[in-house]
């Protein structure tokens, strides 16, 4: 396992469980998830005397990492004292230290609610010269709180003397005000009110709202996947609207057909994104025959915040057709990963670009999440190509050493599918008539990564190539004997001829 620094947690009792006449009390510090041994735990007990005991490290079964607990027992006026547990892990780095400062016990408390309010625009909807942000920290059990204002995550130098605290019944509230210039507010920075209380952090953030007519709203209309169209025979098209500003008004998506014929019932999904925008998806089932015969489907989008409606259309791709060529390869064993192998599938020279790629094992289709397939890219000619990559385990290939890469494409005959079988250990595989041993053309790869070199940003393949078992009748086209480089600006995807 690689070096891993520990996570450090304070261990305390609930105050109500400690007898009021207790003369000594024990608290602890947990260091967990580190590798390798050892950690060094020391305590700062202030003016009090204490005895410490560090328990032997235990191994965490799943990760192989370590955990240890250090206990501190103190006597005397411990109630008002803060204690610091200092954990050092020199294997991470000579100066790696994590400090945790805490009191002997934790009280039951009601945490605060943190909410930022902002001053209004003027009557004309414009921002005034200064904007006030008010941080309301409410409904917490009285106690010390610290308020910090952050601008894009950086602590701001703010006069906090204006913060005022009030108490209502058993709970307290505090408010802090931040005044910003219009320039700072309009600069699209995020302002955060961060509250530290009882060793916990609570916060709320705000920024200038998006304009009421969002610039970036985009709509996309997909074609049905060949798998849905030809195999499942239940094709759907999807209208995707992204980057909408969330608002009271809802997005209205209306489906229609250019022929004027009625459309099926669609399903709709709305998702709030991390950046605060809304994504709306509407999926419409279409008739297989209607689609193949060239019907045009339209998705019309309206929204209260869009000055105009927008429409997207989709129909079967026109132009020449070409069936895909499918080549499947197993990468050689790589030192240190004997129980895993990568299978690669090159599918090329197909037109149009719509294609579905599946992997099968034991005649069962593997979940899409198991494999990674590139988007179709243009070849030097007029067709398209994709790569698909599947990682398989020893357990799988020992159960049955035959994996099938299947391409579903409208130009493939007779049944819109072309497939190739590949074995991890070709010499040992029984396989079917369709099985193939490893080709005599193999994938070059860098010293760092087994399998396909990564596209953009990946390393250039190492000139020393690893060879699979020789094979004279591999069905690949002759041009694969020479180096093929696809797509400018990317690490070349290189194939070598006879090793």
């Amino acid at each position: 396992a690689s070096t891993q620094s520990p996570s450090v947690f304070p261990l305390t009792r609930c105050c109500k469980n400690i007898p009021s006449n207790a003369t000594s009390v024990t608290l602890g510090c947990l260091a967990t998830g580190y590798f390798p041994e050892p950690v060094m735990v020391t305590w700062d007990t202030g003016s009090l005397n204490g005895t410490t005991m560090t328990l032997p490290a235990t191994t965490l079964t799943l990760s192989g990492h370590y955990a240890t607990i250090s206990l501190l027992t103190v006597s005397g006026a411990w109630a008002k004292q803060m204690f610091t547990c200092r954990v050092a892990h020199t294997p991470s780095s000579t100066d790696w230290v994590d400090n945790k400062t805490f009191s002997v016990c934790s009280r039951d408390f009601t945490p605060p609610t943190v909410k930022i309010l902002q001053s209004s625009c003027d009557g004309g909807g414009h921002f005034p010269p200064t904007i006030q942000l008010l941080c309301l920290v409410s409904g917490y059990t009285p106690g010390t709180i610290n308020i910090t204002w952050l601008e894009d995550g950086q602590v701001m130098d703010v006069d906090l003397s204006t913060a005022s605290t009030t108490q209502e019944g058993e709970l307290a509230s505090t408010q802090s005000e931040l005044t910003l210039s219009q320039k700072h507010w309009l600069s699209d920075r995020t302002y955060t009110c961060q509250v530290t209380y009882q060793g916990h952090t609570f916060e709320d953030s705000t920024k200038k709202c998006a304009d009421s007519n969002p610039r970036g709203v985009s709509a996309y209309l997909s074609r049905p996947s060949p798998f849905d169209l030809f195999i499942r025979k239940s094709p759907t098209i999807t209208c995707l609207v992204v980057d909408l500003a969330p608002s009271k008004g809802t997005v209205n998506l209306t489906w229609s057909r250019a022929s004027g014929k009625p459309v099926n019932h669609s399903t709709r999904k709305e998702e709030k994104q991390r950046n605060g925008t809304l994504t709306v998806t509407s999926t419409l089932p279409v008739g297989t025959r209607d689609w193949i015969e060239g019907e045009t489907y339209q998705c019309r989008v309206t929204h209260p915040h869009l000055p105009r409606a927008l429409m997207r259309s989709t129909t079967k791709t026109s132009g020449p057709r070409a069936a895909p060529e499918v080549y499947a390869f197993a990468t050689p064993e790589w030192p240190g990963s004997r129980d895993k192998r990568t299978l690669a599938c090159l599918i090329q020279n197909f037109m149009p670009e719509d294609i579905s790629v599946q992997w099968l094992h034991n005649e069962v289709q593997l979940p899409d999440a198991r494999h990674s397939t590139t988007q179709p890219r243009k070849t030097k000619g007029s067709g398209f190509f994709v790569f698909s990559r599947l990682e398989v385990t020893r357990a799988e290939w020992e159960q049955k050493d035959e994996f099938i890469c299947r391409a579903v494409h409208e130009a493939a005959s007779p049944s819109q599918t072309v497939q190739r079988a590949v074995s991890v250990n070709p010499g040992l595989a029984g396989g079917s008539a369709q099985s193939q041993r490893a080709p005599d053309r193999v994938l070059c790869h860098s010293g760092q990564q087994q399998g396909l070199p990564r596209a953009a940003g990946g390393s250039v393949p190492h000139p020393r190539c690893h060879c699979g078992a020789g094979r004279a009748d591999w069905p690949g086209p002759p041009e694969l004997d020479v180096c093929v480089e696809e797509a400018e600006g990317e690490a070349p995807w290189t194939w070598t001829g006879l090793c």
Partner: antibody, heavy 119, light 110 residues
């Protein structure tokens, strides 16, 4: 067939107000975003305002404040109220229908109504 | 605001000539560039929408092209009825601005 007929133009003194009307027929008004465009004599086309099917409106920056667009789908009519008229507001005002699929331009225009601001 | 700059402001041509009018947007248009033809005393008429789609009833000698910020209207063989003023317009669904129309190009008889 689709028809847009503007009315309400005429000669008005500077500082005065006008309410232009656009009577729509031959289509369902509520399905379309509607726009007012003006053209000063011998000059190019100038966008004034748009109102979408939800009744929300947008204005060219220079028009904000003095111009008010509205629609009454039940009366098949779109309006443009112009206040504090100035000499530079002299123009032919066209009522126009945005294409149903939107973001594609204006597929039908009225013949326009001439507004002349002069003392 | 997106500004539309149309050029040339006028062009002299003869019947049968090929004429190209360009329109440059100050920033990329998400969708909906349209071209109009206007004759004196008449309202404009939609020729092309969505950058390149011919409006109903418009002759095929008119064509539109372009993407991003650069657009063009081409008249392959000028006919007598084509002498008019042409305007481009961005009809972006997500935006409005002061100058959605280009300044216009007058196509005159040489």
């Amino acid at each position: 067939q689709v028809q847009l007929v503007e009315s309400g133009g005429g000669l008005v003194q500077p500082g005065g107000s006008l309410r232009l009307s656009c009577a729509a027929s031959g289509f369902t008004l509520s399905n379309h975003d509607m726009t007012w465009v003006r053209q000063a004599p011998g000059k190019g086309l100038e966008y004034v305002s748009i109102i979408n099917t939800y009744g929300n409106h947008w204005y060219a920056n220079w028009a904000s404040g003095r111009f008010t667009i509205s629609r009454d789908n039940s009366k098949n009519t779109v309006y443009l109220q112009i206040d504090s008229l100035r000499a530079e507001d002299t123009a032919t005002y066209y009522c126009a229908r945005e294409t149903h699929h939107g973001s594609s331009g204006i597929d039908h225009w009225g013949q326009g109504t001439l507004v002349t601001v002069s003392s | 605001d997106i500004q539309m700059t149309q050029s040339p402001s006028s062009v002299s041509a003869s019947v049968g000539d090929r004429v190209t009018i360009t329109c440059q947007a100050s920033e990329s248009i998400y969708s909906g560039l349209a071209w109009y033809q206007q004759k004196p005393g008449q309202p404009p008429k939609l020729l092309i929408y969505d950058h390149s789609t011919l409006a109903s009833g418009v002759p095929s000698r008119f064509s539109g092209s372009g993407s991003g910020t650069e657009y063009a209207l081409k008249i392959s063989r000028l006919q007598p009825e084509d002498f008019a003023t042409y305007y481009c317009q961005h009809a972006d669904y997500a935006h409005h601005s002061d100058n959605v129309f280009g300044g216009g190009t007058k196509v005159e008889i040489k």
